[in-house]
Each structure stands twice: as structure tokens, then as C-alpha cells.
């Protein structure tokens, strides 16, 4: 089901945002332009009419680390990512729409410029719908292409 998100969502108070790293990419693609906050990402998505890709991850998670490497090294992924507003988060937001089936990491959620969470764009694991592993990189690429087909085109 598609869910419309509020652009005024606040950061989770219990997991407040850490100090900004030297680069907002956090290793997911140093040549790409990354937004700093969820609010900024929603605003840019709406105003630029580009879909938003949100990567939830943790520095000390082996699966986040592994996915990050293949994501950053895959030329097709990196090229396609240029067509998105990009955000990677190492903390949870209070917007429950970004964790439809739990706060596991890594997970990747797409948001349409209409501010609708693309809950229909899922990975291959029934118990963690938005999880991707290094072996799923082709599926992630396909899902990025799906997300680029916007729900409604702005005039």
C-alpha cells in the first residue's frame, strides 16, 4: 500500500542525529549529491520532481557494510542514483512510514515526489521487505528503475 508522508516529520528523540560526517555519502557514493536530513530530502524531492531513495544503515552492521561496498562500486547503480534525491541515515526518524515492517538495517525505501512512500517497491525477503543483500544488486537496480516511473507526473 502507498502511504503519503508528512514533510514535517521530526527526528527520533531517542536516537538523535549524530554529528555530521566529513562526507554525507558515508561511503555510499562519494561522487553523488546527498541530502543531510529527511526534511531536506522531502523538500528537494517535491521541488525537483525526483524520487527519493532512503538508505537506512549502521556503521557497525556487517550487512550494511557489505551492501555499501557493492552499491558504491556498481557503476550502473551509481549512474542511476544521479536521478534520485539521496539520503542515507544512521538513525531512525519518527516517521513510521519509513519502517513499514520494522527498523532493521540495511533497508532501502523509495518515496515518490508526491511524498508517497513506495511501499510496493520491495526486495526479495518476505520477513524484511525492504532489505537488500549484495547478491540482490540487480534487483535493487530494477527497483530503482521502477521508482523512476513516477506515480503522477507534475505539469
Amino acid at each position: 500500500k502507498d502511504i503519503t508522508v508528512k514533510s514535517g516529520a521530526k527526528k527520533d528523540t531517542k536516537d538523535s542525529a549524530p554529528k555530521l560526517p566529513q562526507t554525507l555519502s558515508r561511503g555510499w557514493g562519494d561522487q553523488l549529491i546527498w541530502t543531510q536530513t529527511y526534511e531536506e530530502a522531502l523538500y528537494k524531492s517535491k521541488t525537483s520532481n525526483k524520487p527519493l531513495m532512503i538508505i537506512h544503515h549502521l556503521d557497525e552492521c556487517p550487512h550494511s557494510q557489505a551492501l555499501k561496498k557493492v552499491f558504491a562500486e556498481n557503476k550502473e547503480i551509481q549512474k542511476l542514483a544521479e536521478q534520485f534525491v539521496l539520503l542515507n541515515l544512521v538513525y531512525e526518524t519518527t516517521d513510521k512510514h519509513l519502517s513499514p515492517d520494522g527498523q532493521y538495517v540495511p533497508r532501502i525505501i523509495f518515496v515518490d515526489p508526491s511524498l508517497t512512500v513506495r511501499a510496493d517497491i520491495t526486495g526479495r525477503y518476505s520477513n524484511r521487505l525492504y532489505a537488500y543483500e549484495p547478491s540482490d544488486i540487480a534487483l535493487l537496480l530494477d527497483n530503482m528503475k521502477k521508482a523512476l516511473k513516477l506515480l503522477k507526473t507534475e505539469l
Partner: antibody, heavy 120, light 107 residues
């Protein structure tokens, strides 16, 4: 064919240092995680840490973090385990083990191991 | 750290018999569990990864199942060459941890 070959083991006195090597061949070295695992005589297996040769990112078991350091040399397709301030309890066979071919964390191939004995 | 408890510690089995080894994790590890076989004076060999995926070249008599906290390695019709110690490993969280091992002996 994937091959991992450890070397550098031997007898060392307590407080001493040793550098183990793991020479690899048969796959794209920079794109698979490399783990080090040890096995004390007659005991089970203990994970030491891993390194991503592509950029040198590492993670360690907290038990050895202050004394052991992982590194990689892309030109030589080799990874290294530098062990300092060695103790008797570090006596073990040390294995390198490659992660999944696709960059996944699971351990797919193991070297034959090299024995490190810490004794005075 | 995540603790993996393997059982039994030791199993003496006749050829062609079915062998079942269990591995219980102290917390949910999703399906991030591997199984290894180690023969005396040899390095471990990977049999199963992601709980149930068989590594290329491993005989089909080996199979893995489970998710969450409870996992099983099954050897469907034991052969003499399967005499070894079997270990489970969780790679869901740092530090990766191994079970204590199960020694399988041929009667």
C-alpha cells in the same frame, strides 16, 4: 580456482610480535571481505576480524582490537595480520577466510592455516 | 556478543543413518547462519550459508534449515567421509561467533 595461503607463523616469546600473511589468487581480490579466524589447540573457532581490501575498511573482535591490526596490499593480492603484545593464550592456528564471491559477509573459502605458538 | 549453543557435543552414528545437529542463537540472527565441516588437521570447509543455501560442490545429502534463533544441519544418509566436527557461525552481528562444535563419529 580460489586459493588462500597463510604464512608467517612460528614460535614467539610472550610480549613479542608477529605478522601473518594471506596470499590470494583466483578471484577479484579487492571485492571480497577477508576474515581472520583462529583455533587454539583442541578448541573451537574464534573470529578475529575482517578487512575489505578495496578500501581497507576493517572490523575487529573487541578481544583483540588493541593488539591486532589488519591490512591489505592490492598490488600483492595479500592481506596481513599484525599481532603485537602476544600472550600464551594467542597460541593457535590462524586461518584467513574469504567472504562470499558477491561481496556478502558469509565465509566461503578457507586457507590451510598457519600455527602461532607463544611461549617462553 | 551473540552466543551459539550447538547440540549434541558428540554423536556416534552408523553409515546411512540420518544426522541432525542443532544450533541455537542467544538472539534473533535472521537467516545469517553458516555451517562448516572440519576434519582432523584440516581447515574448515563451508557447507551451508544463509541458513539453507548449499555451497557449490557440497553433496546434496547436506541441508540446512531454520531462521531467527533455531537452526538445524541435517546429513540425510551419513557416509564414512562425513566423520568430522561441525560448527555453526552467525554473521548477523559483530563479532561473528561460532558454536562450540559437534563431533560426528562413525560407528
Amino acid at each position: 580456482q580460489v586459493q588462500l595461503l597463510e604464512s608467517g607463523g612460528g614460535l614467539v616469546k610472550p610480549g613479542g610480535s608477529l605478522r601473518l600473511s594471506c596470499a590470494t589468487s583466483g578471484y577479484v581480490f579487492s571485492r571480497s571481505w577477508m576474515n581472520w579466524i583462529r583455533q587454539a589447540p583442541g578448541q573451537g573457532l574464534e573470529w578475529i576480524g575482517w578487512i575489505y581490501p578495496g578500501d581497507g575498511d576493517t572490523n575487529y573482535n573487541g578481544k583483540v582490537k588493541d593488539r591486532f591490526t589488519l591490512s591489505a596490499d592490492k598490488a600483492k593480492n595479500s592481506v596481513y595480520l599484525q599481532m603485537n603484545s602476544l600472550r600464551a593464550e594467542d597460541t593457535a592456528v590462524y586461518f584467513c577466510a574469504r567472504g562470499g564471491y558477491d561481496g556478502s559477509p558469509w565465509l566461503s573459502y578457507w586457507g590451510q592455516g598457519t600455527l602461532v605458538t607463544v611461549s617462553s | 556478543e551473540i552466543v551459539l549453543t550447538q547440540s549434541p557435543d558428540f554423536q556416534s552414528v552408523t553409515p546411512k543413518e540420518k544426522v541432525t545437529i542443532t544450533c541455537k542463537a542467544s538472539q534473533d540472527i535472521n537467516s545469517y547462519l553458516s555451517w562448516f565441516q572440519q576434519k582432523p588437521d584440516q581447515s574448515p570447509k563451508t557447507l551451508i550459508y544463509r541458513a539453507n543455501r548449499l555451497v557449490d560442490g557440497v553433496p546434496s545429502r547436506f541441508s540446512g534449515s531454520g531462521s531467527g534463533q533455531d537452526f538445524t544441519l541435517t546429513i540425510n544418509s551419513l557416509e564414512a567421509e562425513d566423520a568430522a566436527t561441525y560448527y555453526c557461525l552467525q554473521y548477523d552481528e559483530f563479532p561473528f561467533t561460532f558454536g562450540g562444535g559437534t563431533k560426528v563419529e562413525i560407528k
